[in-house]
Interface confidence: medium
């Protein structure tokens, strides 16, 4: 004969587990119901009566299947430093992205917890490894016979002009500028930019400050893997 | 899933002591993990956090006392000059989010840090 | 930083009784509040998180509430097995990330 379908609420046999979308409550001592995601447990479940489920309220909401008492809040709105990329429903919390320019500082499986401005390098330094969604920008001081004049979270070291005759050599920071008005070669004008990174997080937080550039505040300050590479700066 | 902390010693004031804390059954580059301090007697202190990517923050008292690091399986936590106010025990446990909430569900047994002359 | 004053620092309740244990935040932490329990030896155990939720496997005799800035756990009909340190953390995730926990508060069943 197949073996007996039990219902909840029921006493698991000894060693064993309840059943997938059950919960063992340990006041009951009994193989419970859970609740759907979008649900809460309104009344939990006793010996002889199964959890008793109630969808969750404007502005919360349970994403898995559960057995909490309330459902979780939905997070805040999303801050100056993001936009939102997925509405509050019942069934799933809002998620707000890092804004260009913005990376994220401190992700967890959930998403993320905290942006960050992405570094700009000054003048005399350019990009050398970008920003991604969960890093900073590193910067690098520009070769000899390169130079960046901008302060930038994307812009790279480019290489001077070359000059027939050169009226000023170029530096780190400057262009070298020509007595004639056509150079011999030039790379093509305007800076080269770098793509920015969009992290997806679920968290609303405050913006925070640049490691290299932050006042002393009562608050933490971020400090990456490594410490802020040279030649960075604040907005 | 778990959480095991190692290299807690004796050591002098000023000898730098790292301690490392290996995980298994789960990625570190999914999950954020913390570091908690306790004293004899005492309560719980946080010391800091790295996160998923890599990041790492620290408590204002600890910022420039410890360093943390990881690997692809073990998060360091590198204590660069002990003082005998160091000594405690030092649990690594794995800081999650429930969506907009925190909390550190899933800790080793700790390991002991003696700092004396 | 944020800082969490718990009380009382200890406690002592017959079984069956209730026990009730409140942590003040400093500043507004929106819920951000979890609840551990440590035993002689042994590392904390996540109890509670966002205030009210208990975490897996955690007795439904357990409650957390919070009004404004303060946090409660209540332990009802307390057995013998919940005789422990309790202690309230908080996150507060502003121009960085804090974590603060309370001074604990040592539960006797007699």
């Known amino acids: 004969l197949p073996a007996q379908v039990a219902f909840t609420p029921y006493a698991p046999e000894p060693g064993s587990t309840c059943r997938l979308r059950e919960y063992y409550d340990q006041t009951a001592q009994m193989c419970c119901s859970k609740c759907s995601p979008g649900q809460h447990a309104k009344v939990f479940c006793t010996k002889t009566s199964d959890t008793v489920c109630d969808s969750c309220e404007d502005s919360t909401y349970t994403q898995l299947w559960n057995w909490v008492p309330e459902c979780l809040s939905c997070g805040s709105r999303c801050s100056s430093d993001q936009v939102e990329t997925q509405a509050c429903t019942r069934e799933q919390n809002r998620i707000c992205t890092c804004r260009p320019g913005w990376y994220c500082a401190l992700s967890k499986q959930e998403g993320c917890r905290l942006c960050a401005p992405l570094r700009k390098c000054r003048p005399g330094f350019g990009v050398a490894r970008p920003g991604t969604e969960t890093s900073d920008v590193v910067c690098k001081p520009c070769a000899p016979g390169t130079f960046s004049n901008t302060t930038s979270s994307t812009d790279i070291c480019r290489p001077h002009q070359i000059c027939n005759v050169v009226a000023i050599p170029g530096n780190a920071s400057m262009d070298a500028v020509c007595t004639s008005t056509s150079p011999t070669r030039s790379m093509a004008p305007g800076a080269v930019h770098l793509p920015q990174p969009v992290s997806t997080r679920s968290q609303h937080t405050q913006p925070t400050p640049e490691p290299s550039t932050a006042p002393s505040t009562s608050f933490l300050l971020p400090m990456g893997p490594s410490p802020p590479a040279e030649g960075s700066t604040g907005d | 899933q778990s959480v095991e902390e190692s290299g807690g010693r004796l050591v002098t004031p000023g000898t730098p002591l790292t301690l490392t804390c290996t995980v298994s059954?789960?990625?570190?580059?999914?999950?954020?993990m913390g570091w908690v301090r306790q004293a004899p007697g005492k309560g719980l202190e946080w010391i800091g956090i790295?996160?998923?990517?890599?990041n790492t923050y620290y408590a204002t008292w600890a910022k420039g006392r410890f360093t943390i690091s990881r690997t692809s399986t073990t998060v360091d936590l590198r204590i660069t000059s002990p003082t005998t106010e160091d000594t405690a025990t030092y649990f690594c446990?794995?800081?999650?989010?429930?969506?907009?909430?925190?909390?550190?569900?899933?800790w080793g047994q700790g390991t002991l840090v003696t700092v004396s002359s | 930083d944020v800082v969490m004053t718990q009380t009382p620092s200890s406690v002592s309740e017959p079984v069956g009784g209730t026990v009730t244990i409140k942590c003040q935040a400093s500043e507004e932490i929106s819920s951000n509040l979890a609840w551990y329990q440590q035993k002689p030896g042994q590392p904390p155990k996540l109890l509670m998180y966002?205030?009210?939720n208990l975490a897996s496997g955690v007795s439904s005799r357990l409650k957390g509430s919070r009004s404004g800035t303060d946090y409660t756990l209540t332990i009802s009909g307390v057995q013998c097995d919940d005789a422990a340190t309790y202690f309230c953390q908080c996150t507060y995730i502003g121009s960085g990330y804090v974590v603060a926990f309370g001074g604990g508060t040592e539960v006797v069943v007699k």
């Open positions: 059954g789960f990625s570190l580059s999914s999950y954020a």
């Open positions: 790295i996160g998923s990517g890599g």
């Open positions: 446990a794995r800081d999650v989010g429930y969506g907009d909430y925190d909390a550190l569900d899933l």
């Open positions: 966002a205030a009210s």
